[in-house]
Interface confidence: low
């Protein structure tokens, strides 16, 4: 009687995650009577994949009906393959008994799984930085196999070169992860800029995956201040304006001080947006020149996005003509008692 052989013709099979894998196995004899079982791995820790005799294996089906008496094909179909299914699969013949006794194993078929990388996720710095500073962006993608992968960084379509990339783990694994950190030098024009992380992998068939981050989340453009005065129609009033230019983000608190004393505070509203994404804002005061004292200094103090305040001062200029318009008895606050005292626009 010819000795029973268990034949697994393929040494290896490669399949894309989500697809089905067919693992072929034939036996040269149906004698002795007993079941065929499929295992992943060898030795005492091996994992049962399919048992012809009993059990419930939802993702595994036999290619042919194993209950047919003359069928010597015990090939199986595994559906919805995931990277966790990678490994070497053995077709094993048992002799019926209590317990069943292992007779012979096939040589094994190595199943490797090609798995797509997850959509790259780009994360930026936790705190905003100002132009000319360098910020780091991190890109992560997971779950791909095989290990070979290409990652590129772009800023507004231009490829970046200052980045460091790691693929983990270093050794053999069912799937891999990539993490890359790019360093980007901010400019004042970066409010509308975008960084893109692009991942190319054999499973993507030339159509790379992209993750993006907006530099608007990472940048703070500090304002520039300008304070000037203009005469008004009423000869005893002047308009003192604080022009706040080119700032981002919008969060801004402005305080007027008269000789160092707080006169009024306002939060920026009705901003005008510049083409580069930064904002402008102006705040103004009506000043009663008849109530002046010599050397009145008006200060515009701006706190932007929670940063330390910056300020610009202006010494009130009162012409001789304006002084003549005031009676000697006039007294009162420097700021005109209009409601509101100041305005913005």
């Amino acid at each position: 009687e010819e000795e029973l052989q268990v034949i697994q013709p393929e040494k290896s099979v490669s399949v894309t995650a989500g697809e089905s894998a067919t693992l072929n196995c034939t036996v040269t004899s149906l004698i002795p009577v007993g079941p065929i079982q499929w295992f992943r791995g060898a030795g005492p820790g091996r994992e049962l994949i399919y048992n012809l005799k009993e059990g419930h294996f939802p993702r595994v089906t036999t290619v042919l009906d194993p209950t047919k008496r003359n069928n010597m094909d015990f090939s199986i179909h595994i559906s919805n393959i995931t990277p966790a299914d990678a490994g070497t699969y053995y077709c094993v013949k048992f002799r019926k008994g209590s317990p069943d006794v292992e007779l012979k194993s096939g040589a094994g078929t190595e199943l490797s799984v090609r798995a797509k990388p997850s959509a790259p996720v780009v994360s930026g710095p936790t705190a905003r930085a100002t132009p000319e500073h360098t910020v780091s962006f991190t890109c992560e993608s997971h779950g791909f196999s095989p290990r070979d992968i290409t990652l590129k960084w772009f800023k507004n379509g231009n490829e970046l070169s200052d980045f460091q990339t790691n693929v983990d783990p270093a050794g053999k694994s069912v799937s891999y992860s990539i993490r890359s950190t790019a360093r980007v030098v901010l400019t004042r024009r970066d409010v509308h800029s975008q960084v893109i992380c692009e991942v190319a992998h054999v499973t993507l068939q030339g159509d790379p995956l992209r993750g993006t981050a907006n530099l608007s989340e990472a940048i703070r453009v500090p304002p520039t201040l300008e304070v000037f005065q203009r005469p008004m129609r009423a000869e005893n009033q002047v308009n003192v304006t604080c022009q706040v230019r080119k700032f981002y983000p919008q969060r801004l608190l402005l305080t007027w001080l008269e000789n160092g004393n707080v006169s009024q505070t306002e939060t920026a509203s009705t901003l005008t947006e510049n083409k580069d994404g930064t904002y402008n804002w102006r705040s103004w005061l009506l000043v009663n020149t008849c109530a002046h004292r010599d050397g009145v200094v008006l200060t515009c103090q701006v706190e932007h996005d929670g940063q330390p305040a910056v300020s610009k001062s202006h010494a009130l200029e009162v012409s001789a003509h304006q002084k003549e318009q005031c009676s000697d008895t006039t007294s009162g606050p420097v700021l005109a008692p209009t409601a509101p005292l100041g305005g913005s626009g």
Partner: antibody, heavy 118, light 107 residues
């Protein structure tokens, strides 16, 4: 006989806490994925939470951050710690066993009623 | 999340009738679909798993079919004890989700 018995339900005020228990017998609870499923009065079934054999945990969106699933292998028991309870959590809570190979629900407990009301 | 839609929501039938309940998934769930039976005031009972496999002790008058997104539960010959609410459920990915239920009533 394979059996699951829930306990710990009751009346609790909104914002309050409750801990449900599920005692398993006839099988080793740690060898199975275990679940909590609830059913509001007159409504359908809603999956709430699961714990895998490796201790990995899963929650439906509405209970994330408020409920915690756990198990105690020595007592062969499953738990659901429910905090910051809301009226919408009022339901019968069932403890359910998942199948060995595919996690299909096979054994259900009799359920325990949780009422959240002031 | 994967949405499960059962139809009809309610169904009137007579003893001896053959009835079919359908369940549709909002995306492909392979064959990871289960059916449950629930009677008033009782816990649900597991009938079918992996779309067509009967749980131990479930009579063969219950059968399930389907794959991908469309599934059916068929009861071949209704008996008085079969009048209940039936739910389908996907368990391919978390969060597991149930259909809204089909109430089977005596005509």
């Amino acid at each position: 006989e394979v059996q699951l018995v829930e306990s710990g339900g009751g009346l609790v005020q909104p914002g309050g806490s409750l801990r449900l228990s599920c005692a398993a017998s006839g099988f080793t609870l740690s060898s199975y994925d275990m679940h909590w499923v609830r059913q509001a009065p007159g409504k359908g079934l809603e999956w709430v939470s699961a714990i895998g054999t490796a201790g990995d945990t899963y929650y439906t969106g509405s209970v994330k951050g408020r409920f915690t699933i756990s198990r105690e292998n020595a007592k062969n028991s499953l738990y659901l710690q429910m905090n910051s309870l809301r009226a919408g959590d009022t339901a019968v809570y069932y403890c359910v066993r998942g199948g060995v190979w595919d996690d299909a629900f096979d054994i259900w407990g009799q359920g325990t009623m949780v009422t959240v009301s002031s | 999340d994967i949405q499960m839609t059962q139809s009809p929501s309610s169904l009137s039938a007579s003893v001896g009738d053959r009835v079919t309940i359908t369940c549709r998934a909002s995306q492909d769930i392979n064959n990871y679909l289960a059916w449950f039976q629930q009677k008033p005031g009782k816990a649900p009972k597991s009938l079918i798993y992996t779309a067509s496999s009967l749980h131990s002790g479930v009579p063969s008058k219950f059968s399930g079919s389907g794959s991908g997104t469309d599934f059916t539960l068929t009861i071949s010959s209704l008996q008085p004890e079969d009048f209940a609410t039936y739910y389908c459920q996907q368990y391919v990915s978390y969060p597991y989700t149930f259909g809204q239920g089909t109430k089977l009533e005596i005509k």
